[in-house]
Interface confidence: low
């Protein structure tokens, strides 16, 4: 089809080299198309997102992306070439940096419902670069966490190091959506609930003397508890002594809860004490299996082919540790009687 | 059929408690609606009291002079939201709808039929 | 608190008329505001959101303009059935709540 009659977007990704991160196209199509196609995705502050019903039977995947070559040859199916990058209903999600995202992206309707459809698309120009500027040390993470029950804030990286003051007027959305309230380089949350965890995007618009261009990032937002205060707890096994019969095998379970902590770094591990002697003993992983926000339960098993005189002697010991602490658990094996 | 039943309306002194539910069916609290309530005194406009995010967590909002007197809550087992409402004035005198917020916009656009309740000595 | 004015407070049309209602924002709210229908003993009525979005099953004689502060709800060719109050509520979203802001709501009555 022919791009020339699209409405044209310059965007421009400055990420950081040390820091993983996302970006994201939205399709912007001109009105009135964009309420058939993106209606609950990415809106303009014309229009206001709703989760009301009757919209429920818009299909939100009736965009098509391509990326256009520089070399002029035909528009390629983003789909098909570009594994890094995902559609989700009428967004572009880039999953990894690198100057090779450079380029044109053009969105339209997958449907041609009317003539005036045909011209409906959006040609984005994306320019990718490497963050240069090392005057900003402290430039806002991609990633952001807010503290649950508390006040907190969430900045837009590539305008960090600027004073509020200074700030250009910036956009932003979360989820896709317009936050039409928010204006400044860094959103100050009242108080932070579960519903502000998403995916934040902000924008402003750059000028020089030849063009502008909208600078965008995205940021991660993860709402979290206070770090916990209290080592882990063993919730199994509960019982000191476990029946066993000798010669079959056996599988003693540790589950043990584990508190939040921003930097987390679980163990969970069995060892034997055999009289004098005590060692680790090589079992399969731990896994996880239940997280919340609070905490998370992790499980490592110690698995035994058959179970001998010798391990009736000897203590199993489950040890588990975070950095306020540790607590043990051991198991002494006794023979099922009759 | 979805839709919102309030009941609990009553006649109150000055001064006195009184709590509101509304029942709701053909939808489920577990998704991730504002329910909110909102007053109509008699004769006058539409007026916003107080909402709560029925999604994972029980996030409470209320109009500035309803903070302090009045509290939501709900009750997703039962599917219900409720309004405790404490230290009765006669200008509370006025008919209390439930409705449903879609998503995180807060357009109702679902209503209950209301209840009325009456402050009076 | 946006404070939302109405105007005017209550207006007098026959069937057939064009009726304009006004709506004013204490501030800039862009086009997050929402226009509702109410009969006497009934829930109000969603009619429009997003100061010009139809809401499903809404009549298409009803329509919305309007951003930033002020905002007008129209009702091309007034119908027995359109006699009623309207309101129009401030929905601003951000990521703090932000009330809903109901204005003093206009009367229509039969001239």
């Known amino acids: 089809f022919n791009i020339s009659g699209c409405s044209t977007k310059k965007l421009l990704w400055t990420y950081s080299t040390r820091s993983e991160e996302e970006f994201v196209l939205f399709c912007d199509l001109p009105e009135p198309q964009k309420s058939h196609f993106c209606h609950r995705n990415r809106l303009s502050p014309k229009q206001v997102p709703e989760h009301l019903p009757f919209m429920g039977s818009n299909d939100l995947s009736d965009v098509q992306w391509y990326q256009q070559p520089s070399n002029g040859d035909p528009l390629e199916d983003i789909r098909k070439s570009y594994p890094h990058i995902i559609q989700d209903k009428c967004t572009l999600h880039f999953l990894t940096p690198g100057v090779n995202n450079s380029g044109s992206y053009i969105c339209r309707p997958k449907m041609i419902k009317s003539p005036y459809d045909v011209a409906c698309c959006v040609k984005m120009i994306l320019e990718v670069k490497p963050q240069t500027n090392a005057s900003c040390e402290y430039s806002a993470s991609h990633k952001q966490d807010l503290l649950l029950g508390s006040t907190g804030s969430i900045s837009c990286p590539s305008l960090s190091c600027q004073s509020d003051a200074q700030s250009p007027a910036v956009t932003w959305y979360k989820n896709g959506k317009l936050l039409s309230v928010e204006r400044s380089n860094r959103i100050v949350v009242d108080e932070v609930y579960d519903y502000h965890q998403g995916t934040y995007v902000c924008d402003y618009t750059q000028s020089d003397t030849v063009s502008s261009w909208t600078v965008r990032a995205v940021v991660q937002v993860r709402t979290i508890v206070g770090d916990t205060k209290l080592k882990p707890d063993i919730l199994d096994p509960v019982e000191d002594t476990l029946e066993v019969e000798l010669g079959k095998p056996l599988t003693i379970s540790c589950k043990a809860r584990f508190g939040f902590e921003r930097v987390f770094n679980p163990v969970i591990k069995w060892y034997i004490k055999d009289s004098d002697l005590e060692w680790e003993v090589s079992v399969p992983e731990a896994k996880s299996i239940k997280s919340t926000l609070k905490d998370e339960i992790i499980e490592r098993n110690i698995i035994l082919e058959k179970v001998t005189q010798r391990d009736l002697r000897r203590k199993f010991v489950c040890f588990v540790q975070n950095s306020i602490g540790n607590t043990t658990q051991s198991v002494q094996l006794k023979e099922k009687r009759g | 059929e979805v839709q919102l039943e309030e009941s609990g309306g009553d006649l109150v002194q000055p001064g006195g408690s009184l709590r509101l539910s509304c029942a709701a069916s053909?939808?489920?609290?577990?998704?991730?609606?504002?329910m909110c309530w909102v007053r109509q005194a008699p004769g006058k406009g539409l007026e916003w009291v107080a909402c709560?995010?029925?999604?994972?967590?029980?996030?409470?909002y209320y109009a500035s002079w309803a903070k302090g007197r009045f509290t939501i809550s709900r009750d997703t087992s039962k599917n219900t939201l409720y309004l405790q409402m404490n230290s009765l004035r006669a200008e509370d005198t006025a008919v209390y709808f439930c409705a449903r917020g879609g998503g995180i916009i807060y357009t109702q656009n679902l209503w209950g039929q209301g209840t009325l309740v009456t402050v009076s000595s | 608190d946006i404070q939302m004015t109405q105007s005017p407070s209550s207006l007098s049309a026959s069937v057939g008329d064009r009726v304009t209602i006004t709506c004013q924002a204490s501030?800039?709210?862009?086009?997050?505001l929402a226009w509702y229908q109410q009969k006497p003993g009934q829930a109000p009525k969603l009619l429009i959101y997003s100061a010009s979005t139809l809401a499903s099953g809404v009549p298409s004689r009803f329509s919305g303009s309007g951003s930033g502060t002020d905002f007008t709800l129209t009702i091309s060719s007034l119908q027995p059935e359109d006699f009623a109050t309207y309101y129009c509520q401030c929905i601003l979203y951000g990521v703090n709540f932000v009330p809903n802001t109901f204005g003093g709501g206009t009367k229509v009555v039969i001239k």
């Open positions: 709560i995010y029925a999604g994972s967590s029980d996030s409470t």
């Open positions: 053909g939808f489920s609290f577990s998704r991730s609606y504002y």
């Open positions: 501030e800039d709210i862009e086009s997050y």
